[in-house]
Interface confidence: low
């Protein structure tokens, strides 16, 4: 199950996020917006729009494209909400053959970092939290690992 971080946790520094993103076992770091949620047997599928790419692995998804995250139904600690934005960092995607091309599915497993990325900048705590997220995004985007 994914590691859902506490919402608006100001104790998480930009450096902590960068250290996580730059771990060798972490293949990607994305900012995403959840567009739909479907339950299929023992799995929950989240379709998401890829808003920003900070790190990418073998599965080279494109900005603004649709990607899929998958988790076990039993993973109740990592409930993503439709319409919300998240910073998600995790291991390499699973490559699924689809027609004559490949699709990538990102498993939300124990290695996955999931953090709510608020859109609202009006509350002071949101602003300070967004500043930390922006600092992480800027650093990894501009400097890399």
């Amino acid at each position: 199950c994914g590691q859902m971080q506490e919402e608006l946790d100001l104790t998480i520094s930009a450096e902590t996020r960068k250290q996580t993103a730059c771990k060798p076992e972490i293949a990607y770091a994305y900012k995403v917006s959840i567009t739909s949620i479907t339950v299929e047997n023992v799995f929950v599928k989240y379709k998401a729009t890829l808003l920003d790419i900070y790190k990418t692995g073998e599965a080279v998804a494109e900005k603004d494209s649709e990607i899929t995250f998958i988790k076990k139904v039993t993973c109740t600690n990592a409930e993503l909400v439709k319409g919300r934005q998240y910073l998600i960092m995790g291991k390499e995607a699973l490559q699924i053959k689809y027609n004559f091309s490949f699709r990538y599915i990102y498993p939300l497993d124990s290695l996955t970092w999931i953090e709510y990325w608020p859109r609202d900048t009006t509350c002071s705590s949101c602003q300070a939290f967004l500043a930390n997220l922006d600092e992480f995004a800027e650093d990894i985007f501009l400097n890399g690992c």
């Epitope: 100001l10 930009a14 500043a131 922006d134 600092e135 650093d139 501009l142 400097n143």
Partner: antibody, heavy 118, light 109 residues
């Protein structure tokens, strides 16, 4: 009310050193990246350095290796250690707060003047 | 590094008349990373516009910013006496450097 007050400027000989301070108030200092910008007499603005809330630093090529940008979040203070000063470092030095959206400077201090001359 | 070239270097405008300042970048700049500042005589710079077109808090609506790519413009719809000073554009680049334009001096005719 956001306030930035620089101090520490003065006259220094070429090759000398100086430490500038910027006392910040009216906002959560540790949440913001801070910068130093200078303005030579009658000239335009030149970015000197930036420091993130957690202490990552970035420098203009013209000062790299000579200037050190630092901060003490417990004291709400930004510092600029200037070594090996040259005549071309003569300027008004402003400290500025970087906006939460990280590409602009939304508040500036009144500046402190550094004169490098023999 | 990106070089920002402002034009004109100076302009004199009648009170109540419009003014326009251009900022041209040597290579494409993200609109999110372009800002404008005003520096009145004897004062420190003040943020006017960020993100190429968003007015900073407390900035009168006679100031507007526009542009994308390499060409950006600051417009003052009706110049007032308090608008006298030097105007600077500024960008933030991917190599973590902040660059300012050379400045445009605005005077009242």
């Amino acid at each position: 009310e956001v306030q930035l007050v620089e101090s520490g400027g003065g006259l220094v000989q070429p090759g000398g050193s100086l430490i500038l301070s910027c006392a910040a108030s009216g906002f959560t200092f540790s949440s913001y990246a801070m910068t130093w910008v200078r303005q030579a007499p009658g000239k335009g603005l030149e970015w000197v350095c930036a420091i993130s809330g957690s202490g990552s630093t970035y420098y203009a090529d013209s000062v790299k290796g000579r200037f050190t940008c630092s901060r003490d979040n417990s004291k709400n203070t930004l510092y600029l250690q200037m070594n090996s000063l040259r005549a071309e470092d003569t300027a008004v030095y402003y400290c500025a707060r970087r906006g939460l959206r990280y590409n602009y400077f939304d508040y500036w201090g009144a500046g402190t003047t550094v004169t490098v001359s023999s | 590094d990106v070089v920002l070239t402002q034009s004109p270097l100076s302009l004199a405008v009648l009170l109540g008349q419009p003014a326009s300042i251009s900022c041209r970048a040597s290579q494409s700049v993200s609109s999110s990373y372009l800002a404008w500042y005003q520096q009145r005589p004897g004062q420190s710079p003040r943020l006017l516009i960020y993100g190429a077109s968003s007015r900073a808090t407390g900035v009168p609506d006679r100031f507007s910013g526009s542009g994308s790519g390499t060409d950006f413009t600051l417009k003052i719809s009706r110049v007032e006496a308090e608008d006298v000073g030097v105007y600077f554009c500024q960008q933030y680049g991917r190599s973590l450097e902040y660059t300012f334009g050379g400045g445009t001096k605005l005077e009242i005719k």
